[in-house]
Interface confidence: low
């Protein structure tokens, strides 16, 4: 299709080389007054416009994204050629940063209802640059945490080094929806609830003598509880002796509850004590069996192919540890009688 009639928007993504970050493009079809070809629903001032209710469609996935190759080749369907770019409804998610994401991206409705709808499209010229060392060293992270029940703020990474007074007008989106009230480089949250979690996008306009473009950053915000002050506790095994049958296989499970920690490095391992010797056992990987906001339950099993007399003289010890401390639980095997 002919893209010469598409409205054009220029965006800049400056990514940090020292952190993982994502990026998004919205299929921002023009407002009705800008193009009579795009039949967008008119919104009352109180409604928050979503990207994008074009042609009365409720299905926001009715959008096709293309990339325009720089060598003049035909447009490429994003879904077929770029697995690191994911289309979620009408938003394009870039999962990995890199200058090779630079280029022209075009979106248009899949459903063409009249010959004129071909012009209902947006061309986004994306420039991707690594952050230079000269950029602010302490810029806000692209992953930010809010402590539940307390006051917090979400900072726009590309503007976090500027004072509020210097900051240009910022447009914020949360999970693809415009936050029409927010215009500064920080969103202040008086009391944090779990619904404050999500993907936030901040946009502001920069210009030089020739043109203007939108600088965009994406922030993943999670709501968390405070770091635990407790060492992990072992939920299983509870008993320190276990009745077993000689010659039979045996699996002993160690389940431990770890309180939430922002930097979470749980340790759960099995070792064997035999008289004055002690050694760690190579056992299957630990697995998380329950994860909540406040804690996580992790399980790790020790597997004996068959129980021997020697095993009855040993102690099997489960050892768990977090940044606060460690806990152990030992199990002595006892032959089942009768």
């Amino acid at each position: 299709f002919n893209i010469s009639g598409c409205s054009t928007k220029k965006l800049l993504w400056t990514y940090s080389t020292r952190s993982e970050e994502e990026f998004v493009l919205f299929c921002d079809l023009p407002e009705p007054q800008k193009s009579h070809f795009c039949h967008r629903n008119r919104l009352s001032p109180k409604q928050v416009p979503e990207h994008l209710p074009f042609m009365g469609s409720n299905d926001l996935s009715d959008v096709q994204w293309y990339q325009q190759p720089s060598n003049g080749d035909p447009l490429e369907d994003i879904r077929k050629s770029y697995p690191h770019i994911i289309q979620d409804k009408c938003t394009l998610h870039f999962l990995t940063p890199g200058v090779n994401n630079s280029g022209s991206y075009i979106c248009r409705p899949k459903m063409i209802k009249s010959p004129y709808d071909v012009a209902c499209c947006v061309k986004m010229i994306l420039e991707v640059k690594p952050q230079t060392n000269a950029s602010c060293e302490y810029s806000a992270s692209h992953k930010q945490d809010l402590l539940l029940g307390s006051t917090g703020s979400i900072s726009c990474p590309s503007l976090s080094c500027q004072s509020d007074a210097q900051s240009p007008a910022v447009t914020w989106y949360k999970n693809g929806k415009l936050l029409s009230v927010e215009r500064s480089n920080r969103i202040v949250v008086d009391e944090v609830y779990d619904y404050h979690q999500g993907t936030y996008v901040c946009d502001y306009t920069q210009s030089d003598t020739v043109s203007s473009w939108t600088v965009r950053a994406v922030v993943q915000v999670r709501t968390i509880v405070g770091d635990t002050k407790l060492k992990p506790d072992i939920l299983d095994p509870v008993e320190d002796t276990l009745e077993v049958e000689l010659g039979k296989p045996l699996t002993i499970s160690c389940k431990a509850r770890f309180g939430f920690e922002r930097v979470f490095n749980p340790v759960i391992k099995w070792y064997i004590k035999d008289s004055d010797l002690e050694w760690e056992v190579s056992v299957p990987e630990a697995k998380s069996i329950k994860s909540t906001l406040k804690d996580e339950i992790i399980e790790r099993n020790i597997i004996l192919e068959k129980v021997t007399q020697r095993d009855l003289r040993r102690k099997f010890v489960c050892f768990v540890q977090n940044s606060i401390g460690n806990t152990t639980q030992s199990v002595q095997l006892k032959e089942k009688r009768g």
Epitope: R79, K80, Y82, P83, H84, Q87, T96
Partner: antibody, heavy 117, light 112 residues
């Protein structure tokens, strides 16, 4: 196209590296998977590597199999080989079909690895 | 890890007939539709036939039809041709960091 190489006879406990070479498309644009097939048996997915170089594995393959990439090739390293690893190893390109996920749309002819003493 | 169970195997039918292969997943595939069918002939690599449960891959005849959702899927081959004799595999994607994909055990189709 995609082509695997490096298949050979290896003794139990040994290691080897298989290489997958892509031509006609860029590994910067596609994730790549390794799949194996023991003689007369079914297909078994080993793992895949993303365009950004991060690799993901089947539970059974973790530890002994390592997938890595350069700009032109994707490698599969097998360590502590056992006779169960005797198989034809395929490299497959993954194409993204939208929200539903990825599929293997282009396969190499495979390379045979035999583990025997 | 998810397990995909294919039935029956082998299955045979005459030229011009129809065969139906079933694939049962132990857990729902990603978005209920990350399921593909592959055809493999002896000495050859697999070939993608159907993806997204029912979308026929490029160059594949419309005689191949996929259906189902979630955990239960079916491949139907109608107007069987001699060239359809092969082993057919279903494969599910799970969008997870480990065990991202799983293959069914395969179903051999014999054309009489």
């Amino acid at each position: 196209s995609v082509e695997e190489s490096g298949g050979r006879l290896v003794t139990p406990g040994g290691s080897l590296t298989l290489t997958c070479t892509a031509s006609g498309f860029s590994l910067n644009n596609y994730h790549m998977s390794w799949v194996r097939q023991a003689p007369g048996k079914g297909l078994e997915w080993i793992g895949f590597i993303r365009t950004d170089g991060s690799a993901f594995y089947a539970t059974w393959a973790k530890g002994r199999f390592t997938i890595s990439k350069t700009s032109a090739t994707v490698d599969l390293k097998v360590t502590s080989a056992t006779t169960e690893d005797t198989a034809t190893y395929f490299c497959a390109r993954m194409f993204y079909a939208g929200d539903s996920g990825h599929y293997f749309d282009l396969w190499g002819p495979g390379t045979l690895v035999t583990v025997s003493s | 890890a998810a397990v995909l169970t294919q039935t029956p195997s082998p299955v045979s039918a005459a030229v011009g007939g129809t065969v139906t292969i079933s694939c049962q997943a132990s857990q729902s595939v990603h978005n209920n539709k990350n399921l593909a069918w592959y055809q493999q002939k002896p000495g050859q690599p697999p070939k993608l036939l159907i993806y997204d449960v029912s979308t026929v891959a490029s160059g594949v005849p419309s005689r191949f039809k996929g259906s189902g959702s979630g955990t239960q899927f079916t491949l139907t081959i109608s107007d069987l041709e001699c060239d359809d004799a092969a082993t057919y595999y279903c494969a599910g994607g799970y969008g997870s960091y480990t065990d991202t994909f799983a293959f069914g055990g395969g179903t051999e189709v014999v054309v009489k």
